[in-house]
């Protein structure tokens, strides 16, 4: 909501999760792994990479089925705590200028840092208008105090807020699982919020920094060369 059409393939790590329709976004973090939101779990997922217009075959797409879908073991569907999911692709993505991985964070998100949020979610805060072309939004990371004041009792240490307290610009339904990138690192995963783009209700995002070890351990445990002892 309130964003702009991204320059074509300018977000090469952005993926669309498809189950006959686009239902969530995700981020490519290595040639065979995608990170998304825990609440984007489905038993069958096709990962679509290199997309810009999700309704038109433009020649840069790679459609790869999910081989493994691993939700965080402490995902809470009521609170959306630990809202993170890993998808292993059935075959490695072909990395090129339009499809490439995003780095995991080396430090937690800092208030005031500019970030890029992207997705194919609803562009209306009231009503429904799902775009075909990838939308981008530049937004600042908010302080944890601002975040907690916006959602009293709902924000865990695994969540942070990004956006505008005045409303008007936000992620929305269909953006879940997608990336929040600051300084070339995946800091957040689109998670939840009360409505979209409402005053004093900024978007809430999964704090990827808290899961770097889980991500690395899970990838290691689910790689072909892993041996059990």
């Amino acid at each position: 909501v309130g964003g702009y059409i991204c320059e074509e393939n300018s977000v090469p790590y952005q993926v669309s999760l498809n189950s006959g329709y686009h239902f969530c976004g995700g981020s490519l973090i290595s040639e065979q792994w995608v990170v998304s939101a825990g609440h984007c779990y489905k038993s069958r997922i096709q990962v679509r990479l290199g997309e810009h217009n999700i309704e038109v075959l433009e020649g840069n797409e790679q459609f790869i089925n999910a081989a493994k879908i691993i939700r965080h073991p402490k995902y809470n569907s009521r609170t959306l705590d630990n809202d993170i999911l890993l998808i292993k692709l059935s075959s490695p993505a072909v990395i090129n200028s339009r499809v490439s991985a995003i780095s995991l964070p080396t430090a937690p998100p800092a208030a005031g840092t500019e970030s890029l949020i992207s997705g194919w979610g609803n562009t209306l805060s009231s009503g429904a208008d799902y775009p075909d072309e990838l939308q981008c939004l530049d937004a600042p990371v908010l302080s944890q105090a601002e975040c907690e004041a916006s959602y009293p009792g709902k924000i865990t240490n695994n969540m942070f807020c990004v956006g505008f307290l005045e409303g008007g610009k936000d992620s929305c339904q269909g953006d879940a699982g997608g990336p929040v990138v600051s300084n070339g690192e995946l800091q957040g995963i689109v998670s939840w919020g009360y409505g979209c783009a409402q005053k004093n209700r900024p978007g809430v995002y999964t704090k990827v920094y808290n899961y770097v070890d889980w991500i690395k351990d899970t990838i290691a445990a689910n790689s072909h060369h892993h041996h059990h002892h």
Epitope: G20, R78, Q173
Partner: antibody, heavy 125, light 107 residues
Framework: QVQLVQSGAEVKKPGASVKVSCKAS????????ISWVRQAPGQGLEWMGW????????NYAQKLQGRVTMTTDTSTSTAYMELRSLRSDDTAVYYC??????????????????WGQGTTVTVSS | DIQMTQSPSSVSASVGDRVTITCRAS??????LAWYQQKPGKAPKLLIY???SLQSGVPSRFSGSGSGTDFTLTISSLQPEDFATYYC?????????FGGGTKVEIK
Amino acid sequence: QVQLVQSGAEVKKPGASVKVSCKASGYTFTDYAISWVRQAPGQGLEWMGWISASTADTNYAQKLQGRVTMTTDTSTSTAYMELRSLRSDDTAVYYCARGDEVVGKRTYYIGMDVWGQGTTVTVSS
Amino acid sequence: DIQMTQSPSSVSASVGDRVTITCRASQGISRWLAWYQQKPGKAPKLLIYAASSLQSGVPSRFSGSGSGTDFTLTISSLQPEDFATYYCQQANSFPITFGGGTKVEIK
């Protein structure tokens, strides 16, 4: 395979209550929601309400507000629909059906992919 | 509430015919529409979801199209087992609403 199995037919008097059960199997119960739909004899489909199996959030049809309660028991993967103060025009086949959760910022798509076999409820004095 | 208007309410057709059923929403619902088939005494069965995606196991003679307010279900070559009642359903927002149904009968 994925299936929803409903409780058996009921005959009730006007003013009574009925509680229909819907037992799910073949999938993780809390990853989906359950809708309830009824069909009066010779009529079309009427949506009654929806319940999230993971959060127990509900959304009821306005015309049934105050008379219907939907619940789930995650330990047995069973959904329940109770309808109170029954009237003769509540005579219908009642169906449960599986649909996507409405949660977070995932695309909301509230179609129904798997249906129970139906439970006939007859309200007659 | 979003009203769903289906037409025609009934259609007589022969085996091998092409049958088209339309559904109109009272306001835009993007692609969030489903089509169901129901035979007498049976539960509805999902045919098409998200306007045009074919449900697993459903024959390819069934297809769906449309976006916004106008949607179509097409049976390219009617088979004996296709004689049934068909319903559309908007899957965009609560309350969920169904069309009135279209009965496909043998001519």
